[in-house]
């Protein structure tokens, strides 16, 4: 490549590589690479690989990363996941079986363990593995709000599909609320979209984690693939750095 | 400002001003400023000013402009608007009065006059002037699909408000479809969000352009402020330039 | 668009995204990132000629303007447009961590 | 953020958005744009010091990295981040036209 003077492509590559060295360490707020002396031998644990793969895979309904906020979002986010409370928990008994909805509850103590303060959360996604679907289905996501009321969050038009597919809903604001409140268990409801005229409001889509002898007959969980919250948050110690440097520039 | 050498701020400003001269002409695909010899004397026509103000004002539900596609979206878009067919038109008689919906129909010949080819359309917004609203209302927008079926498009949670406020819905895909099809009149429905359990599904929000002795008792139009489609499209002659230069670079 | 599809398959001399794969072990001498082993970082390179002045023969410039200086900058610069994040796995002591690093992969460039 | 709120009220020497109002008649000698009479175009200016090399004392650099070279470019550059469109009214012959020009107003800048 030449402009007024010849560009040394190799030099540019070396500078870019060195800049990436600084970028990665700075995003992790590490002054030097972490020591590997304590690392257990053998392959990475299954759960860690599953979490890594969940993060790596783009899923239906997740948009490409928007332009980040300059400061806090520059730094790396720790990724954790919290699985839905198993369906034999008594919380599910309070919600009447229905053909148009399924319910998903989460233990807020697990959420707080992963993200100690609401301000640290930068993204929360509800991920559901939808099994094959014969017809197009319009679904809505609700958040449990007070005693028996539900607040609408978002909707999705699901195309028919022969293969299972992960769905993702951005629930950052909701999880941030939950972390601020004192509740022990919080939940979502996935419902068929009900139009004012329509009579057939059955939830046709199968979500992994609920057996479907009948919709609402909530029972066994299919392994790790039941619904979960994928959380991205600034680790506490990194956040303390940030606060102390907030007034600089 | 100084780096290794002092920056001449005035020179930078002059270069930026000259660059803007080129940018504006190039976005309009004008080789030189248009002659003003034929411009009628006196102020701008009212309708033109109204259209300019509609374009200038950001409204509820309209996102900031996304990063544009590099080629076609670099160039200026001509802005036009098409008002909803007046409610005394017989098309409205076919749709039963209901407490949960209002209907808005548009003449596709007017749309085609504004945008001769579907591919030229870059954005279409349905704009509605909502009057004051006492309670929060969750509304849904539908597109007339076939004989008497409606396709869900999007939804909006409207906060209570003492003053009128413009709402905007992105309906680009729908209007592009309409331009491709042969229909004469096409339409939207704005409905209350109906949940599967809920009984009270009344559309509480008043939209300017419909008298509200009873919802659905569609009658007089309040001037130019009835619902309209705001269209942004590449003018035909500019598009021809683009096609001829498509294989360059 | 000056993206990987266009730039990797052409010999474009002006602003474009250029291929660069970083192997953490080979290029940075790092063993501490356990996943991935490396990634396609890429980078932006190439001139954005400043192509407007009062005496320019304008008709020749018109078609190029939106590529070389669409933002009408006083000194246009070839910079990333679309970026993607990179998740990594590393250990802190005995504890494995999964972290997501924003804006690590350059997918396309622009003159800005 | 290096936006108008921060930059217009500070004496920031590094990359920042700078104030620039363009009056179509005075600055460009144009009478043909009927609305608006001018607009706040603004521009980006200021160095993005390159602040990483193998021998850098890293702890001093850490806090600055995300401002001066967040994208790890080989030569970081101060460029627009958030841009806004500008609608204009002009005549073609006797016919008034309203057109929207994308990305005309610089609201914030970044090192990229």
């Amino acid at each position: 490549l030449s402009t007024c003077k010849t560009i040394d492509m190799e030099l540019v590559k070396r500078k870019r590589i060195e800049a990436i060295r600084g970028q990665i360490l700075s995003k992790l707020r590490l002054a030097s690479p972490p020591s590997q002396g304590e690392v257990p031998p053998g392959p990475l644990p299954e759960a860690v690989l599953a979490l890594y793969n969940s993060t790596r895979d783009r899923v239906a309904g997740e948009s490409a990363e928007p332009e980040p906020e300059p400061e806090a979002d520059y730094y790396a986010k720790e990724v954790t996941r919290v699985l839905m409370v198993e369906t034999h928990n008594e919380i599910y008994d309070k919600f009447k079986q229905s053909t148009h909805s399924i319910y998903m509850f989460f233990n807020t103590s697990e959420l707080r363990e992963a993200v100690p303060e609401p301000v640290l959360l930068s993204r929360a996604e509800l991920r559901l593995l939808r099994l094959k679907l014969k017809v197009e289905q319009h679904v809505e996501l609700y958040q449990k709000y007070s005693n028996n009321s539900w607040r609408y969050l978002s909707n999705r038009l699901l195309a028919p599909s022969d293969s299972p597919e992960w769905l993702s809903f951005d629930v950052t604001g909701v999880v941030r609320q939950w972390l601020s409140r004192g509740g022990e268990i919080e939940g979502f409801r996935l419902s068929a979209h009900c139009s004012c005229d329509s009579r057939d409001n059955t939830l046709q889509v199968d979500i992994n984690g609920f057996t479907t002898g009948r919709r609402g007959d909530l029972a066994t969980i299919h392994g790790m693939n039941r619904p979960f919250l994928l959380l991205m948050a600034t680790p506490l110690e990194r956040a303390q750095h940030l606060q102390s440097s907030r007034h600089r520039r | 400002l100084s780096t290794c050498k002092t920056i001449d701020m005035e020179l930078v400003k002059r270069k930026r001003i000259e660059a803007i001269r080129g940018q504006i002409l190039s976005k309009l695909r004008l080789a030189s400023p248009p002659s003003q010899g034929e411009v009628p004397p006196g102020p701008l026509p009212e309708a033109v000013l109204a259209l300019y103000n509609s374009t200038r004002d950001r409204v509820a539900g309209e996102s900031a402009e996304p990063e544009p596609e590099p080629e076609a979206d670099y160039y200026a878009k001509e802005v036009t608007r098409v008002l909803m067919v007046e409610t005394h038109n017989e098309i409205y008689d076919k749709f039963k009065q209901s407490t949960h919906s209002i209907y808005m129909f548009f003449n596709t010949s007017e749309l085609r006059e504004a945008v001769p080819e579907p591919v030229l359309l870059s954005r279409a917004e349905l704009r509605l002037l909502r009057l004051k609203l006492k309670v929060e209302q969750h509304v849904e927008l539908y597109q007339k699909y076939s004989n008497n079926s409606w396709r869900y498009l999007s939804n909006r949670l409207l906060a209570p408000s003492d003053s009128p406020e413009w709402l905007s819905f992105d309906v680009t895909g729908v209007v592009r479809q309409w331009l491709s099809r042969g229909g004469e009149i096409e339409g939207f429905r704005l409905s209350a969000h109906c949940s599967c359990d809920s009984r009270d599904n009344t559309l509480q929000v008043d939209i300017n352009g419909f008298t509200t002795g009873r919802r659905g008792d569609l009658a007089t139009i309040h001037g130019m402020n009835r619902p309209f489609l705001l269209l942004m499209a590449t003018p035909l002659e500019r598009a021809q330039h683009l096609q001829s230069s498509r294989h360059r670079r | 668009a000056l993206d990987t599809n266009y730039c990797f398959s052409s010999t474009e001399k002006n602003c474009c995204v250029r291929q660069l794969y970083i192997d953490f072990r080979k290029d940075l001498g790092w063993k501490w990132i356990h996943e991935p082993k490396g990634y396609h970082a890429n980078f932006c390179l190439g001139p954005c000629p400043y192509i407007w002045s009062l005496d320019t023969q304008y008709s020749k410039v018109l078609a190029l303007y939106n590529q070389h200086n669409p933002g009408a900058s006083a000194a246009p610069c070839c910079v990333p447009q679309a970026l993607e994040p990179l998740p990594i796995v590393y250990y802190v002591g005995r504890k494995p961590k999964v972290e997501q690093l924003s804006n690590m992969i350059v997918r396309s460039c622009k003159c800005s | 953020a290096l936006d108008t709120n921060y930059c217009f009220s500070s004496t920031e020497k590094n990359c920042c958005v700078r104030q620039l109002y363009i009056d179509f008649r005075k600055d460009l000698g144009w009478k043909w744009i009927h609305e608006p009479k001018g607009y706040h175009a603004n521009f980006c200016l200021g160095p993005c010091p390159y602040i990483w090399s193998l021998d850098t004392q890293y702890s001093k650099v850490l806090a600055l990295y995300n401002q001066h070279n967040p994208g790890a470019s080989a030569a970081p550059c101060c460029v627009p981040q958030a841009l806004e469109p500008l609608p204009i009214v002009y005549y073609v012959g006797r016919k008034p036209k309203v057109e929207q020009l994308s990305n005309m107003i610089v609201r914030s800048c970044k090192c990229s």
Epitope: - | L30, P34, S35 | - | -
Partner: antibody
Framework: EVQLVQSGAEVKKPGASVKVSCKAS????????MHWVRQAPGQGLEWMGR????????AYAQKFQGRATLTVDTSTSTAYMELSRLRSDDTAVYYC???????????WGQGTLVTVSS | DIQMTQSPSSLSASVGDRVTITCRAS??????LNWYQQKPGKAVKLLIY???RLHSGVPSRFSGSGSGTDYTLTISSLQPEDFATYFC?????????FGQGTKLEIK
């Protein structure tokens, strides 16, 4: 190639009318206004008027108001200029010219000589 | 109407010469000044529009400059095919008006 082809030379008696045609090709006829300009022997160029083929809108120079009539046939991409009540000083070459909105004439016909003589 | 005064009305020059023709408007025409070339029996050709913009296909030896009321056409090095009559025209205000022409002849 963009072209304007005009009708052939005419000889007319004073008081008569003449109708000159101008056939456009190589571009969208309705996208550009068509202007008429004349040039008397040994003189400069004089603008007569213009027509917008899309809307039919017309403007005349004051001197030709009431005597010149501009028309178009969009089906054949042809513009016409008719001048009535001819006088000897109307002897000139008549040109049609395509107008660009920048205020200039970018394509011209080859000209039609109209001679008015008794 | 805006009056356009062109000078000189004729001039003789040789191949390779640099030639300048001027055009003065009776009021400010804000750069809407165009130059045309006319040869006997041929269609009129646009050379320069908006003071200094070269029309496509026109050799770069032709250039234009000026502002306000005073404008100039320059041919940097005359070629045999440049001997013709040149007209200026204002595109600022209706009615469009032309200069009376400058006839460029071989010396």
């Amino acid at each position: 190639e963009v072209q304007l082809v005009q009708s052939g030379a005419e000889v007319k008696k004073p008081g008569a009318s003449v109708k000159v045609s101008c056939k456009a090709s190589g571009y969208t006829f309705t996208s550009y206004w068509m202007h008429w300009v004349r040039q008397a022997p040994g003189q400069g160029l004089e603008w007569m008027g213009r027509i917008d083929p899309q809307s039919g809108g017309i403007a005349y120079a004051q001197k030709f108001q009431g005597r010149a009539t501009l028309t178009v046939d969009t089906s054949t991409s042809t513009a016409y200029m008719e001048l009535s009540r001819l006088r000897s000083d109307d002897t000139a070459v008549y040109y049609c010219a395509r107008w660009d909105y920048g205020g200039y004439f970018d394509v011209w016909g080859q000209g039609t000589l109209v001679t008015v003589s008794s | 109407d805006i009056q356009m005064t062109q000078s000189p009305s004729s001039l003789s020059a040789s191949v390779g010469d640099r030639v300048t023709i001027t055009c003065r408007a009776s009021q400010d025409i804000t750069n809407y000044l165009n130059w045309y070339q006319q040869k006997p029996g041929k269609a009129v050709k646009l050379l320069i529009y908006y003071t200094s913009r070269l029309h496509s296909g026109v050799p770069s030896r032709f250039s234009g400059s000026g502002s306000g009321t005073d404008y100039t056409l320059t041919i940097s090095s005359l070629q045999p095919e440049d001997f013709a009559t040149y007209f200026c025209q204002q595109g600022d205000t209706l009615p469009w008006t032309f200069g009376q022409g400058t006839k460029l002849e071989i010396k």
